[in-house]
C-alpha cells in the first residue's frame, strides 16, 4: 500500500484584504518561489509508439533528464510501479537486465535512457490504452517516475510525444539539505519583501495529514505538465494486463557501460528524432509514493518521512517479486 499525504502546499493570500494591487505586488515573490521549488528538479520523459508493421507491438522509450548517476530503471504497465502496475523490465547499470513477457527486448540506449520493445498476442499483449511507466532511481537524489500512453486516436507508426513527469523521492538528508537551503532563501526573500512593503506574505499552509509520509506539492515547471498532474489515474483495461510473468527472455547488460564515465555530471537530452518539445502525452499522469530512496519494487520504508515534489523504487504488485533473466 502506498501511503500518500499532503505536504505543505503553497497557498496564495486570501483575497479581499489587499485588492488587485496587492496581488500584483506578490507576483514576483511567487515567481521566485516557483523557481526556488522547481530549481534543479530532474525529469523523466516517456514515449510510447505502436509499430506500424505489428499492431500488437509497442516501443517504449524513457529517459532521465538529470545529472545524477542512475542506479536502477524499472518499466511497468498498468500504472506506476508498486501501485498496481506490473513490472515489465528492470535494468541495472552494472548487473544487467531482467525482463518479463511480453517484453521482447529491453536495452540501454544511452547512459540515461532506455528502450523496451513489447510484443504479444492474447492475454499478455498490450493494447492502445495501456499506460506505461518508467522509474529512474538515482542515488542519493531519489526516484523519478513518469507514465505515458498512446493518444486514443494514434495511428500505427506514430508516437506520443515524450511525457516529462517528474517525481522526486529522495532521502531526507539530501532533500532537506538542498531544498532546505532553497526554501530558507525563499522564506528570507519573502521576509524582506514583507518588511519592505508592510504587506502580509503568502502563508505556508501546514498539512493535516500523517507525519509518516509528507508530500510537497510544488509548482509544475510548465502549464502542460501541471495540467497532467491533475489528471486522476482512473481505470486500467484489465484485458491488456499479462496473464503470467514467469517467462522471460535473456538479455545482457550494457556492454558500453564500463567505458563511460560513471560519475559524469551531464544533462542528457531526449532524442530529437522522436520529439522536439517534451510535452505530456494525453492521458498521462504522475504519481507519488512515500519513503526514502528505494529500489524498483521495494516497499516504502516504515520509518522516516520522504518528501516528493510532485503529486502522484519494492508495495503491492501483480506479482510477488520481479524475477527475470539477465
Amino acid at each position: 500500500m502506498r501511503t500518500e499525504a499532503q505536504v505543505p502546499a503553497l497557498q496564495p493570500p486570501e483575497p479581499g484584504l489587499e485588492g488587485a494591487m496587492g496581488h500584483r505586488t506578490l507576483v514576483l515573490p511567487w515567481v521566485l518561489l516557483t523557481l526556488c521549488v522547481t530549481a534543479g528538479t530532474p525529469e523523466v520523459w516517456v514515449q510510447v509508439r505502436m509499430e506500424a508493421t505489428e499492431l500488437s507491438s509497442f516501443t517504449i522509450r524513457c529517459g532521465f533528464l538529470g545529472s545524477g548517476s542512475i542506479s536502477l530503471v524499472t518499466v511497468s504497465w498498468g500504472g506506476p510501479n508498486g501501485a498496481g502496475g506490473t513490472t515489465l523490465a528492470v535494468l541495472h547499470p552494472e548487473r544487467g537486465i531482467r525482463q518479463w513477457a511480453p517484453a521482447r527486448q529491453a536495452r540501454w540506449e544511452t547512459q540515461s535512457s532506455i528502450s523496451l520493445i513489447l510484443e504479444g498476442s492474447g492475454a499478455s499483449s498490450p493494447c492502445a490504452n495501456t499506460t506505461f511507466c518508467c522509474k529512474f532511481a538515482s542515488f542519493p537524489e531519489g526516484s523519478w517516475e513518469a507514465c505515458g500512453s498512446l493518444p486514443p486516436s494514434s495511428d500505427p507508426g506514430l508516437s506520443a510525444p515524450p511525457t516529462p513527469a517528474p517525481i522526486l523521492r529522495a532521502d531526507l538528508a539530501g532533500i532537506l539539505g538542498v531544498s532546505g537551503v532553497l526554501l530558507f532563501g525563499c522564506v528570507y526573500l519573502l521576509h524582506l519583501l514583507r518588511r519592505h512593503k508592510h504587506r502580509p506574505a503568502p502563508r505556508l499552509q501546514p498539512s493535516r495529514t500523517s507525519p509518516q509520509a509528507p508530500r510537497a506539492r510544488a509548482w509544475a515547471p510548465s502549464q502542460a505538465s501541471q495540467a497532467a498532474l491533475h489528471v486522476p489515474y482512473a481505470t486500467i483495461n484489465t484485458s491488456c494486463r499479462p496473464a503470467t510473468l514467469d517467462t522471460a527472455h535473456p538479455h545482457g547488460g550494457p556492454s558500453w557501460w564500463a567505458s563511460l564515465p560513471t560519475h559524469a555530471a551531464h544533462r542528457p537530452q531526449g532524442p530529437a528524432a522522436w520529439a522536439s518539445t517534451p510535452i505530456p502525452a494525453r492521458g498521462s499522469f504522475v504519481s507519488v509514493e512515500n519513503g526514502l530512496y528505494a529500489q524498483a519494487g521495494e516497499r516504502p520504508p516504515h520509518t522516516g518521512p520522504g518528501l516528493t515534489l510532485f503529486p502522484d523504487p519494492r508495495g503491492p504488485r501483480a506479482m510477488e517479486g520481479p524475477l527475470g533473466v539477465r
Epitope: 513490472t87 528492470v90 552494472e94 542519493p140 510477488e320 517479486g321 524475477l323
Partner: antibody
C-alpha cells in the same frame, strides 16, 4: 509466511561431493532468485552464486565456478547446491537466501547447513 | 571485485548506547548497500536495504545512511538483543561482496 528450510549437517570425505538442499515455502518459488553463500568458521560471508528458479539460469562468483553447481526443482520448490572435489577449505556453513526483488536485498535466509571435513 | 571495509571489527557498548558501524566500498556503489545482522546461533536477518530503507519488522532504532562509497548503520539506543555480528553487502556489481563484519559486544 516465507520460509527457507535447509538440509542437515554433512560430514564429508576429502575429494567427495555433497548436495545441499533449500526448500522454499510461503511464496511463489519461481518469482525470486535464490542465492547461495558461504561462511567459514569465524569469518565473513561470501557470495557463491545465484539461480533463477523460473528457468534455471545461473550466475557465479568466479571463485566458485568450478566448485558449485546450482539447480532447482520447481515441482518441490527446492533449490540445490552441489559442491564437488571437497577439501578442508570447503568446510563451512552454507546459506541459501532469497532475493527480495530484482537486483534487491536478501530478505529471507535459511538456517544454514554445516559441511565438515571428516579427515 | 569491490572490496568492502567494515569498521570497527569489534566494539564494546552498553545498553542504551548509540552506536555507529561503518562500511567503506573500494568504489562507488550507487546506494546498493544492505546491512545484515547475524545472531550467535547463525540466524541472519536483513535490517536495512538500499542504504537507508528499514526492512519490514525491524525496530526503528536501526537506521542507515551514506552515499558514494561510505555508508553507516546506526543503532540509536542499544537493547540486549542487538549484540550480534553485523555485515554490510554491496550488490551494485558482480561478484556481490560483504564486509568482514563488526562484532558488537556488551561492555
Amino acid at each position: 509466511q516465507v520460509q527457507l528450510q535447509q538440509s542437515g549437517a554433512e560430514l564429508v570425505k576429502p575429494g567427495a561431493s555433497v548436495k545441499l538442499s533449500c526448500k522454499a515455502s510461503g511464496y511463489t518459488f519461481t518469482s525470486h532468485y535464490m542465492y547461495w553463500l558461504k561462511q567459514r568458521p569465524g569469518q565473513g560471508l561470501e557470495w557463491i552464486g545465484e539461480i533463477n528458479p523460473s528457468n534455471g539460469d545461473t550466475k557465479f562468483n568466479e571463485k566458485f565456478k568450478s566448485k558449485a553447481t546450482l539447480t532447482v526443482d520447481k515441482s518441490s520448490s527446492t533449490a540445490y547446491m552441489q559442491l564437488s572435489s571437497l577439501t578442508s577449505e570447503d568446510s563451512a556453513v552454507y546459506y541459501c537466501t532469497r532475493e527480495k526483488d530484482a537486483f534487491s536485498a536478501l530478505d529471507y535466509w535459511g538456517q544454514g547447513t554445516s559441511v565438515t571435513d571428516s579427515s | 571485485d569491490i572490496q568492502m571495509i567494515q569498521s570497527p571489527s569489534s566494539m564494546f557498548a552498553s545498553l542504551g548506547d548509540r552506536v555507529s558501524l561503518s562500511c567503506r566500498a573500494s568504489q562507488g556503489i550507487r546506494g546498493h548497500l544492505d546491512w545484515y545482522q547475524q545472531k550467535p546461533g547463525g540466524t541472519i536477518k536483513l535490517l536495512i536495504y538500499s542504504t537507508s530503507i528499514l526492512n519490514f519488522g525491524v525496530p526503528s532504532r536501526f537506521s542507515g545512511s551514506g552515499s558514494g562509497s561510505d555508508y553507516s548503520l546506526t543503532i540509536s539506543s542499544l537493547e540486549s538483543e542487538d549484540f550480534a555480528d553485523y555485515y554490510c553487502l554491496q550488490r551494485n556489481a558482480y561478484p556481490l561482496t560483504f564486509g568482514a563484519g563488526t562484532k558488537l559486544e556488551l561492555k
